[in-house]
């Protein structure tokens, strides 16, 4: 139980893509404000988003310090204009989030086809190396820097004139595929972490087709 007119947050949900991580909750505040705290299992609580009327809090800066840790957050509710007020147990009303392990759970962002180049009956398709907000020596790491060989890409490709799709896989960011001469092909890619049990795959990239600007053709 909390103070009069104060309700506990509920539906605490982690929204995370490529380690950009936001905690969301309900309800929209009426005469109350929120403060969020985040901690690792063995660490101290750190307060964020002080006395906010938002129902989300960006916790990216905290989780990117170590994406392989497991995190817990909690949302405190305070009466608006009386943030010192506490619940009947002598502390503010709060609700805990589910545990969140970024390395295992962050969604893979939609990849982008950087380029494709045809040489005769071969096409080289290159996927952009997506940047994350994880840092090392003041530089941002790519998805590959974080996941290494555990990150693969799946390429879907098909003749523009038909609907039958073929697939190829790579543990780099490049595909080299065989195509029929004189045919135009379309491509889409998907990032995959095969070792995961949840959030294994990204959404498909936008489709790119030969004969459009991204491509290059050489005899």
């Amino acid at each position: 139980s909390g103070t009069t007119n104060t309700v506990a947050a509920y539906n605490l949900t982690w929204k995370s893509t490529n380690f950009k991580t936001i905690l969301e909750w309900e309800p929209k505040p009426v005469n109350q404000v929120y403060t969020v705290q985040i901690s690792t299992k063995s660490g101290d609580w750190k307060s964020k988003c002080f006395y906010t009327t938002d129902t989300e809090c960006d916790l990216t800066d905290e989780i990117v310090k170590d994406v392989k840790q497991t995190y817990l957050a909690r949302v405190f509710s305070y009466p608006a204009g009386n943030v010192e007020s506490t619940g009947s147990a002598g502390e503010p009303l709060y609700e805990n989030s589910p545990e969140f392990t970024p390395y295992l759970e962050t969604n893979l962002g939609q990849p982008t086809i950087q380029s494709f180049e045809q040489v005769g009956t071969k096409v080289n398709v290159t996927v952009e190396d997506e940047r994350t907000l994880v840092r090392r020596n003041n530089t941002f790491l790519s998805l590959r820097d974080v996941f290494g060989k555990d990150l693969i890409y799946t390429l879907y490709y098909w003749k523009s004139s038909s609907s039958g799709k073929k697939t190829a896989k790579t543990n780099t960011n490049e595909f080299l595929i065989d195509v029929d001469k004189g045919e135009n092909y379309c491509f889409s890619v998907q990032a995959v972490i095969p070792s995961r049990t949840v959030n294994r795959k990204s959404t498909d990239s936008p489709v790119e087709c030969m004969g459009q600007e991204k491509g290059e053709f050489r005899e």
């Epitope: 295992l104 590959r144 290494g148 060989k149 780099t172 070792s195």
Partner: antibody, heavy 120, light 113 residues
Framework: EVQLVQSGAEVKKPGESLRISCKGS????????IEWVRQMPGKGLEWMGD????????NYSPSFQGHVTISADKSISTAYLQWSSLKASDTAMYYC?????????????WGQGTLVTVSS | DIVMTQTPLSLPVTPGEPASISCKSS????????????LTWYLQKPGQSPQLLIY???TRESGVPDRFSGSGSGTDFTLKISRVEAEDVGVYYC?????????FGQGTKLEIK
Amino acid sequence: EVQLVQSGAEVKKPGESLRISCKGSGYTFITYWIEWVRQMPGKGLEWMGDILPGSGSTNYSPSFQGHVTISADKSISTAYLQWSSLKASDTAMYYCARSGYYGNSGFAYWGQGTLVTVSS
Amino acid sequence: DIVMTQTPLSLPVTPGEPASISCKSSQSLLYVYGQKNYLTWYLQKPGQSPQLLIYWASTRESGVPDRFSGSGSGTDFTLKISRVEAEDVGVYYCQNDFSWPLTFGQGTKLEIK
């Protein structure tokens, strides 16, 4: 402090089963690959396979696939290497190791090794 | 599978002198877009577990003395010790950390003359 502590030496007969263990501490066990490496007497290092405890996903060297099984119990931060039927040629030192923080950054921490002797 | 080949297999060195070990892989270990080579070096001292020296071909692991350096790209790599000390004796291994199955070189035994 990160530590990998392996179970003690074993002496077994051919055909017997065996499970050796590797307990991790001082880090988040579920998010780092645990590697298993064999070193036969007087020989070099051979990678056997690995497991990501958070999901149970495994990879095996073709040389060891089907002969050993790698598993983990994340509730007690322990990985296992097991044989259903040992051979004399399984006599070796077995090391577990933990992957580095960054992708493809090697085996940053190693256990002390478990010596397995298989002899009739 | 990627095959790793080290030379020499034995390396006698006088303390204070430099030492160099070569490692060749049967396929490129270069990840083009990150400009990283996924090649790792380990040292196994007598009677001990192996220890990580260098990852990404040239990045020293924390706590490894700066007399150790790694270089190379693609399929050809080198581990150099600028001035060998008595505590450097042991077997040095290179490893493919580019793709599964992971594979080690056969090892180079460094001994003091």
